[in-house]
Interface confidence: low
């Protein structure tokens, strides 16, 4: 006999990186017929929603109107159908950004390199932090974590055209409180010996959405959002 229901998906809209004082919605998608959803924050019950009518709704939303450092942390959700509860969702790491200061990102030996050349990004922030995050616009799997008291090095190694794209970095005051984003640095890689045609960049989110971190595709499925966020958060952990 089935003891639990499948776990729901959890994600944040517009994104799990939320500028302080901005709004965010935590979404939990379970099954039609679920009579109750519970949102847990840092292991404790945070909010409850009971959709009406349950047979026509498979998703609930928990709205946070004013993001701050106290609201940043790990969220999960569960739902029940009748008396049967689901497995808990994956953890959603909700991050507050635009805290305190702005790092500077540079790339060495430069933003225009030949394929095969070794490239290193440097993210610098003079205020007290020890963890840095390098993000490439596009797939969230391009998240790297680095450490240093004022600067972190992010060696990409010998690059290929797959490394082309726009990068930003953040300083992290803790796992869930990040700095303002750096200005963008666009890496151009030319002369790929293995593939002389200009390979397309990874599927990317709209470049102009970085300012507000609306890194979600307009046509993307909700589950895609959830998986996207979860991939990035696993890398952060």
């Amino acid at each position: 006999q089935q003891q639990t229901l499948p776990k729901p998906f959890i994600w944040a809209e517009p994104h799990f990186m939320v500028p302080k004082e901005k709004q965010v919605t935590i979404c939990c998608q379970g099954n039609y017929g679920a009579v109750e959803y519970q949102l847990h924050f840092e292991g404790s019950l945070f909010a409850v929603d009971r959709p009406k009518p349950p047979e026509r709704i498979n998703k609930v939303q928990f709205y946070i109107p004013d993001m701050n450092s106290r609201m940043a942390g790990q969220y999960s959700c569960i739902y029940r159908v009748g008396e049967l509860w689901s497995e808990p969702s994956n953890l959603l790491d909700l991050v507050v950004t635009e805290m305190y200061d702005t790092p500077t990102l540079s790339v060495h030996p430069g933003p225009e390199v030949i394929s095969g050349e070794k490239v290193t990004f440097y993210c610098r922030l003079d205020t007290a932090t020890s963890m840095f995050l390098l993000l490439k616009e596009g797939r969230s799997s391009h998240v790297q974590r680095g450490y240093g008291k004022v600067q972190a090095e992010f060696p990409l190694g010998p690059v290929t055209t797959a490394h082309r794209g726009t990068y930003r970095c953040f300083g992290s005051y803790n796992n869930h409180a990040w700095s303002f984003p750096s200005e963008p640095v666009k890496l151009l890689v030319t002369g790929d010996i293995e593939n002389t045609s200009l390979a397309p960049e990874d599927p990317t989110f709209p470049a102009d959405t970085w300012g507000t971190y609306l890194l979600t595709t307009e046509t993307g499925l909700q589950k895609d959002h959830a998986l996207w966020d979860h991939t990035a958060q696993n890398l952060l952990r």
Partner: antibody, heavy 115, light 107 residues
Framework: QVQLVQSGGGLVQPGRSLRLSCAAS????????MHWVRQAPGEGLEWVSV???????YYADSVKGRFTISRDNSKNTLYLQMNSLSAEDTAVYYC?????????WGQGTLVTVSS | DIQMTQSPSSLSASVGDRVTITCRAS??????LAWYQQKPGKAPKLLIY???RLESGVPSRFSGSGSGTDFTLTISSLQPEDFATYYC?????????FGQGTKVEIK
């Protein structure tokens, strides 16, 4: 407070070598990138070399293959080994601290290459 | 390498004047620009980094602006101690490169 004290400059004949030192204090030396910048008499600033906290090094084309930057983190000291010197290398040499922008500078040391 | 071009190469101004120095990069450098002040016989002093961020201890009459290729250093009200040579430097890529300098002289 942060201090960078330079030594090792002087008069040297063309083709000879010289080693400059920069003793650092007042900060955690091995956390920072360190640069050498030079200034020929009456001229502007010219970047020479950098060594990052991770150990990677870069050089200006004008000194590549002749100059070597190094650091001894146990002694909080930065070095510039200059070989095959020519008259064009005559300048005041500054060490400086910083990753990209140069926050603190040494007092400078004059290197004169002349026969 | 990225070339940095400053203008003017020199200027004469009086105490209290508003002074503007420009710096142009040969390619886009985002906001990766620093400004330094140098007085004769002394080491340069950092004034501005990341185009507009004032270094600690630098008077607020100094300000920086710009992004991409065009940048400006402004001294809102020139003081006697501000007569010096000013350099811009891009910190976008290696090698970092300096402008040729702008000498601010007393009129």
């Amino acid at each position: 407070q942060v201090q960078l004290v330079q030594s090792g400059g002087g008069l040297v004949q063309p083709g000879r070598s010289l080693r400059l030192s920069c003793a650092a204090s007042g900060f955690t030396f091995d956390d920072y990138a360190m640069h050498w910048v030079r200034q020929a008499p009456g001229e502007g600033l010219e970047w020479v070399s950098v060594i990052y906290s991770g150990g990677s090094t870069y050089y200006a084309d004008s000194v590549k293959g002749r100059f070597t930057i190094s650091r001894d983190n146990s002694k909080n000291t930065l070095y510039l080994q200059m070989n095959s010197l020519s008259a064009e290398d005559t300048a005041v040499y500054y060490c400086a601290r910083g990753a990209q922008w140069l926050v603190n500078w040494g007092q400078g040391t004059l290197v004169t290459v002349s026969s | 390498d990225i070339q940095m071009t400053q203008s003017p190469s020199s200027l004469s101004a009086s105490v209290g004047d508003r002074v503007t120095i420009t710096c142009r990069a040969s390619q886009g450098i985002s906001n990766a620009l620093a400004w330094y002040q140098q007085k004769p016989g002394k080491a340069p002093k950092l004034l501005i980094y990341a185009a507009s961020r004032l270094e600690s201890g630098v008077p607020s009459r100094f300000s920086g602006s710009g992004s991409g290729t065009d940048f400006t250093l402004t001294i809102s009200s020139l003081q006697p101690e501000d007569f010096a040579t000013y350099y811009c430097q891009q910190h976008y890529s290696t090698p970092p490169t300096f402008g040729q300098g702008t000498k601010v002289e007393i009129k």
